[in-house]
Interface confidence: low
């Protein structure tokens, strides 16, 4: 016997209180697949999050981060503070890269300069906090 709920399309839910009639998802909720018995609450992009895509009856809202922050985690579950090039984010905020390390992005951590001598090369251009060394012949 076919489950009557399987006929309910995305954007609706199978309402047990109304003889398993397919009812539209209430405001601020959605169902992205058919045959669902409940609609999921829409994600709200608050605070440091901003709305990239509004919630519809068939798809959840999508968030990104306000300027000065970048997304972290699946589906932008967190916003992480941007730092300047030449810095890394620590639990005390942005800190300059230590000597011998660099970061050429606004996110991520400082990485050691390339050791040119490992490849039998010499340093052509010295490294900075923002840039790796350039190795030469």
């Amino acid at each position: 016997l076919q489950d009557p709920c399987s006929n309910c399309p995305a954007g609706t839910f199978c309402d047990n209180n109304r003889n398993q009639i397919c009812s539209p998802c209430p405001p601020n909720s959605f169902s992205s697949a058919g045959g669902q018995r409940t609609c999921d609450i829409c994600r709200q992009c608050k605070g440091v999050f901003r709305t990239r895509k509004e919630c519809s009856s068939t798809s959840n809202a999508e968030c990104d981060c306000t300027p000065g922050f970048h997304c972290l985690g699946a589906g932008c579950s967190m916003c992480e503070q941007d730092c300047k090039q030449g810095q890394e984010l620590t639990k005390k905020g942005c800190k300059d890269c230590c000597f011998g390390t660099f970061n050429d992005q606004k996110r991520g951590i400082c990485r050691p300069w390339t050791n040119c001598s490992l490849d039998g090369k010499s340093v052509l251009v010295n490294g900075t906090k923002e840039r790796d060394v350039v190795c030469g012949p």
Epitope: L72, S77, T90, K91
Partner: antibody, heavy 118, light 108 residues
């Protein structure tokens, strides 16, 4: 060789005070953040407080905020933890650790035991 | 506060076996900020892994770390007698700094 040596622990009554010290050697003390981490008998590790290289920025766990004060004297290569209004739940081994911020705590002292009991 | 939950609480294994320890965060943590420590009775903790997967100085290559987001793993490929200890994960992504409750690796 990096060494951290804590001292100042002991038995103190509830409501009392104690000042822990951590003498550092083998590295440029004034260049590093430092932290205190404690461990109650038979329990896990709990971060207590940290301080930046200049001593201007400090942070505390909620459980000790307003009662404990972290400080440092870079001329003496020494880290301190002033503990006031001590409670039974502050009983623990207190470790000082060099704090690499993003990269965790790479060197630890041997710990000093603080017992708060009447 | 980011809560780190370690599992299992105790792992009973024999020398030579593989140990897999889990650390789950209550919210996403950049892998750069996740560390693992080993602690033996009466001793201070020792840093094993930082940045979720980088071995600290002097740590043998049988120790490896992996993971991202909310799920992190410490693997000991072949347990040596000196590896039986308690292991803690720790995050320094945001205040307060937090540790997991620990996993004890004991001899079976």
């Amino acid at each position: 060789e990096v060494q951290l040596l804590e001292s100042g622990g002991g038995l103190v009554q509830p409501g009392g005070s104690l000042r822990l010290s951590c003498a550092a050697s083998g590295f440029t003390f004034s260049s590093y953040d430092m932290s205190w981490v404690r461990q109650a008998p038979g329990k896990g590790l709990e971060w207590v407080s940290d301080i930046d290289p200049t001593g201007s920025k400090t942070d505390y766990a909620d459980s000790v905020k307003g009662r404990f004060t972290i400080s440092r004297d870079n001329s003496k290569n020494t880290l301190y933890l002033q503990m006031n209004s001590l409670r039974a739940e502050d009983t623990a081994v207190y470790y000082c650790a060099r704090d690499l911020m993003v990269y965790g705590f790479d060197y630890w002292g041997q710990g000093t035991l603080v017992t708060v009991s009447s | 506060e980011i809560v780190l939950t370690q599992s299992p609480g105790t792992l009973s294994l024999s020398p030579g076996e593989r140990a897999t320890l889990s650390c789950r965060a209550s919210q996403s943590v950049s892998s750069s900020y996740l560390a693992w420590y080993q602690q033996k009775p009466g001793q201070a903790p020792r840093l094993l892994i930082y940045g979720a997967s980088s071995r600290a100085t002097g740590i043998p290559d049988r120790f490896s770390g992996s993971g991202s987001g909310t799920d992190f793993t410490l693997t000991i490929s072949r347990l040596e007698p000196e590896d039986f200890a308690v292991y803690y994960c720790q995050q320094s992504y945001s205040y307060p700094v937090t540790f997991g409750q620990g996993t004890k690796v004991e001899i079976k």
